[in-house]
C-alpha cells in the first residue's frame, strides 16, 4: 500500500488557446485530470488501473501552482494504491478549460481539452521527487512525482506491513525494509521475549521484563542458581531442590540432631577432655584437681584424701601436708613404726606380720579401705555414672541418679521413645532429646505418619530428555531439573530451537 504523488508546478499557455487552436473566452480557466495506470510501451486510452484524480481550476492561461500540501490542499495530488508497487507505471495528464463551474467530464464539450501529455517508465519507491517538463507547440507543463509507502508499509514495493508496538505481543519499531527492530531488553522473532538479568540461570530462572531474574520453584538467589533446601533443614545444604545434606556433626532428616555436642557447645571446663557419647550427650574427663559433670568444680588437693593411716590433711598454697598419727611417718603417713602387737587395723581388719614383724598389712572387711582399714569405701570416686549421671553412696553399694533420657545402672542407656513403635504405616522412628520423630514413607504424613497424603508427583515420570524430577513436598507438585541444552517446565524444548508443535 502506497501513494503516487504528483506535484504540479507551472503551466504555460501564453496564447490562451485550446488544443484545437481556438482561443478560450475570455481566457483558459485551467484544471487537470490525471490518470495513473500500469506500464504500457505505448500509452493508450483505457482504464486508469492505478487510479485517477482531478483538480479544481488552478489558474488562467499561464500560472504557477502553489504547494498546498502543508495546508491540507490538493497539491501534490495523491493517487493511493492498495497493492504491491510494480516499479513501473504510465501517467496521463490532461489540461482542460472549464467554461462553467461543472467540471464533470460529461458536462464539458470534447474540444475543451487544452493539452494532453503521456509518459511511462520505471519508478522506485523513495522520498526523492523526479522533476519533468513536457512541451507541446502551444503549452508547457512542469511537474514532479514520486511514490512513497503508506503509513506502516515498508520495503522496495510497499508490500510489508509493520506497525510499531510495545505491549505483550511485541516490543519493537520498524526498520525501513519492514523488519522488526527490537526495543532494548527484548528478543525473539516478535521481540516478545525479555532478556533476563545477565547470568540468570537458563533453566532455573526466567523473567517477565528485561534485566529481571525470577526463580522457578526450588531455586533462589539473585541468579536463581542456589537450590532451596528441604523446609525445616537446620544444619544442612542442598545441591538440588528440597534436599537436606547434613553439615559435619549433624544428623536427622532436618539435620537438627547434634552429633558433635563437644565441638558445637564446648561444655567441658578447665581444660577437660570432651568425648561425644551420643545425640546431645557427652562425657568430660577432668584434669587433676577438678570434678563435676563439666569439670566445673575445683577440687581441694585434700579432697582426694592423700594422707593414709589416719593422717590429717592440711591444704597449703603449693599443695598439702599430712599430719601423721603416732606410729606413722612419710609424705602420706604411709610408713608405719607399729606392728600387729599394736592392733593397728580398724573396723575389724585383720593384721598380718611382714618382714619378720618389722612391718604389717591390714586385710580390710568389705566397705573399708586404707592402710589401717580406717576409710569407708567411697564408690563414687571413679565417676562411674555416664551421660552426666549423679553418683550416690548407699551404704555398701552405690547408685547412679540419671539425667532425663538415660537409664541403666551407670546411666549408659539412652531411653528409647521408639520402643513402643509409635510410627504408623511403616514410618521410621528417630529418638530425639525431648521425644521422638517419625520419618514417613511416600503417601503418608503427620506426626505419627497417620495421615494418608497424595502420591509422589514424580511417580508419573513427567520430565523429558533425561531430566531429574524432584517432588516439592510442600505443594505435592514436581520440578524438573533440565540437563544442559533443554528448557521448559518439563524440559521438553531444546535450547535455541523454536518449539515445534503438531498442530
Amino acid at each position: 500500500s502506497g501513494v503516487f504523488q504528483l506535484q504540479l508546478q507551472e503551466f504555460i499557455n501564453e496564447r490562451g488557446v485550446l488544443a484545437s487552436g481556438r482561443p478560450c473566452e475570455p481566457g483558459c480557466r485551467t484544471f487537470f485530470r490525471v490518470c495513473l495506470k500500469h506500464f504500457q510501451a505505448v500509452v493508450s486510452p483505457g482504464p486508469c488501473t492505478f487510479g485517477t484524480v482531478s483538480t479544481p481550476v488552478l489558474g488562467t492561461n499561464s500560472f504557477a501552482v502553489r504547494d498546498d500540501s502543508s495546508g491540507g490542499g490538493r497539491n501534490p495530488l495523491q493517487l493511493p494504491f492498495n497493492f504491491t508497487w510494480p516499479g513501473t507505471f504510465s501517467l496521463i495528464i490532461e489540461a482542460w478549460h472549464a467554461p462553467g463551474d461543472d467540471l464533470r467530464p460529461e458536462a464539458l464539450p470534447p474540444d475543451a481539452l487544452i493539452s494532453k501529455i503521456a509518459i511511462q517508465g520505471s519508478l522506485a519507491v523513495g522520498q526523492n521527487w523526479l522533476l519533468d517538463e513536457q512541451t507541446s507547440t502551444l503549452t508547457r507543463l512542469r511537474y514532479s512525482y514520486r511514490v512513497i509507502c503508506s503509513d506502516n508499509y515498508y520495503g522496495d514495493n510497499c508490500s510489508r506491513l509493520c506497525k510499531k508496538r510495545n505491549d505483550h505481543f511485541g516490543h519493537y519499531v520498524c526498520q525501513p525494509d519492514g523488519n522488526l527492530s527490537c526495543l532494548p531488553g527484548w528478543t525473539g522473532e516478535y521481540c516478545q521475549q525479555p532478556i533476563c538479568l545477565s547470568g540468570c540461570h537458563e533453566q532455573n530462572g526466567y523473567c517477565s521484563k528485561p534485566a529481571e531474574c525470577l526463580c522457578r520453584p526450588g531455586w533462589q538467589g539473585r541468579l536463581c542458581n542456589e537450590c532451596i533446601p528441604h523446609n525445616g533443614c537446620r544444619h544442612g545444604t542442598c545441591s538440588t531442590p528440597w534436599q537436606c545434606t547434613c553439615d559435619e556433626g549433624w544428623g536427622g532428616l532436618f539435620c537438627d540432631q547434634d552429633l558433635n555436642y563437644c565441638t558445637h557447645h564446648s561444655p567441658c571446663k578447665n581444660g577437660a577432655t570432651c568425648s561425644n557419647s551420643g545425640q546431645r550427650s557427652y562425657t568430660c574427663t577432668c584434669r587433676p584437681g577438678y570434678t563435676g559433670v563439666d569439670c566445673e568444680l575445683e577440687l581441694s588437693e585434700c579432697d582426694s584424701n592423700p594422707c593414709r593411716n589416719g593422717g590429717s590433711c592440711k591444704d597449703q598454697e603449693d599443695g598439702y601436708h599430712c599430719l601423721c598419727p603416732p606410729g606413722y611417718y612419710g609424705l602420706h603417713c604411709e610408713h608405719s613404726t607399729l606392728s600387729c602387737a599394736d592392733s593397728p587395723c580398724f573396723n575389724g581388719g585383720s593384721c598380718r606380720e611382714r618382714n619378720q614383724g618389722a612391718n604389717y598389712a591390714c586385710e580390710c572387711p568389705p566397705n573399708f579401705t586404707g592402710s589401717n582399714c580406717e576409710k569407708k569405701v567411697d564408690r563414687c570416686t571413679s565417676n562411674p555414672c555416664a551421660n552426666g549421671g549423679q553418683c550416690l553412696n548407699r551404704g555398701p553399694s552405690r547408685m547412679c541418679r540419671c539425667r532425663p533420657g538415660f537409664t541403666g545402672t551407670y546411666c549408659e542407656l539412652h531411653v528409647s521413645d521408639c520402643a513402643r513403635n509409635p510410627c504408623a504405616h511403616g514410618g521410621t522412628c528417630h529418638d530425639l532429646e525431648n521425644g521422638l520423630m517419625c520419618t514417613c514413607p511416600a503417601g503418608f504424613s503427620g506426626r505419627r505418619c497417620e495421615v494418608r497424603t497424595s502420591i509422589d508427583a514424580c511417580a508419573s515420570s513427567p520430565c523429558f530428555n533425561r531430566a531429574t524430577c524432584y517432588t516439592d513436598l510442600s505443594t505435592d507438585t514436581f520440578v524438573c531439573n533440565c540437563p544442559y541444552g533443554f528448557v521448559g517446565s518439563r524440559c521438553e524444548f531444546p535450547v535455541g530451537l523454536p518449539p515445534s508443535f503438531p498442530w
Epitope: 525473539g188 518449539p499 498442530w503
Partner: antibody, heavy 121, light 106 residues
C-alpha cells in the same frame, strides 16, 4: 490442532468467587509464542476481553475488572484458570478461553466452546 | 478507556458486497482482527493484522485499516455469512472488542 475446554460450576451465588479452568490439549501451553486469554459474552451482548497469561505466569487484565480478576497457569497440567471475585448478576455470561497468537498480532485463532455461568442466589 | 465503534447492523443481498466499519482513535496504527460469530457458536478469527486471512477462511473476506477506520469487506456475500462480526485491537496491554455488527443476508 489445539483444543481448549472450559470447566467449572455453571451457577455461582452473588458475592462469591467464580472459578473456571481451561484445559489445553493437542499442544503445549509452555510456548512463548502464545498468550492464553479469557473472554466473556453476556446473554445477547458483545464480547468483553477479561485478561490473559503466558506460560511463565505473566498476566494482563482488563482495567475495568482488574481488582476482581486473577488468572493463573499450571504448565504441568496444561491448564490455565480464571477467578473472578465478588460476583454480581452483571457477571452472568458465557465465558470463553482462547489462544492468542503472537505471530497473528494477538489474534485469537483457537477458542473453547464456552461455558455459561449464571450468578444467582 | 479505548473504544471501537461498529454499526449495529448491515444488510446485503446475496452476491453483493457487505462492508463493516470499525472506528477508533488512531486505529490505523494498531493491528485489527475480525471475528465471525454465528448463534450458539464460539467466535472464529476471519482476519488478523488488518488484512490477512487465516487458512480455511474464504477469499471473499478481506480487510483494510487506515486513519481511524478499519473495514471488513465480504464480496459476493453468501447466506452462510449471516452472523455477528466483531473487530478487535490491542490498546497498550488491553484487548478491546468492537460493539459488534449483525450482518443480514436478505
Amino acid at each position: 490442532e489445539v483444543q481448549l475446554q472450559e470447566s467449572g460450576p455453571g451457577l455461582v451465588k452473588p458475592s462469591e468467587t467464580l472459578s473456571l479452568t481451561c484445559t489445553v490439549s493437542g499442544g503445549s501451553i509452555s510456548s512463548s509464542n502464545y498468550y492464553w486469554g479469557w473472554i466473556r459474552q453476556p446473554p445477547g451482548k458483545g464480547l468483553e476481553w477479561i485478561g490473559d497469561i503466558n506460560y511463565n505466569g505473566n498476566t494482563y487484565y482488563n482495567p475495568s475488572l482488574k481488582s476482581r480478576v486473577t488468572i493463573s497457569v499450571d504448565t504441568s497440567k496444561n491448564q490455565f484458570s480464571l477467578k473472578l471475585s465478588s460476583v454480581t448478576a452483571a457477571d452472568t455470561a458465557v465465558y470463553y478461553c482462547a489462544r492468542e497468537a503472537v505471530a497473528l498480532g494477538g489474534g485469537a485463532d483457537d477458542w473453547g466452546q464456552g461455558t455459561l455461568v449464571t450468578v444467582s442466589s | 478507556s479505548y473504544e471501537l465503534t461498529q454499526p449495529p447492523s448491515v444488510s446485503v443481498s446475496p452476491g453483493q458486497t457487505a462492508s463493516i466499519t470499525c472506528s477508533g482513535e488512531g486505529l490505523g496504527d494498531k493491528y485489527v482482527s475480525w471475528y465471525q460469530q454465528k448463534p450458539g457458536q464460539s467466535p472464529v478469527l476471519v482476519i488478523y493484522e488488518d488484512s490477512t486471512r487465516p487458512s480455511g477462511i474464504p477469499e471473499r473476506f478481506s480487510g483494510s485499516n487506515s486513519g481511524d477506520t478499519a473495514t471488513l469487506t465480504i464480496s459476493g456475500t453468501q447466506p452462510m455469512d449471516e452472523a455477528d462480526y466483531y473487530c478487535q485491537a490491542w490498546d497498550s496491554e488491553t484487548g478491546v472488542f468492537g460493539s459488534g455488527t449483525k450482518v443480514t443476508v436478505l
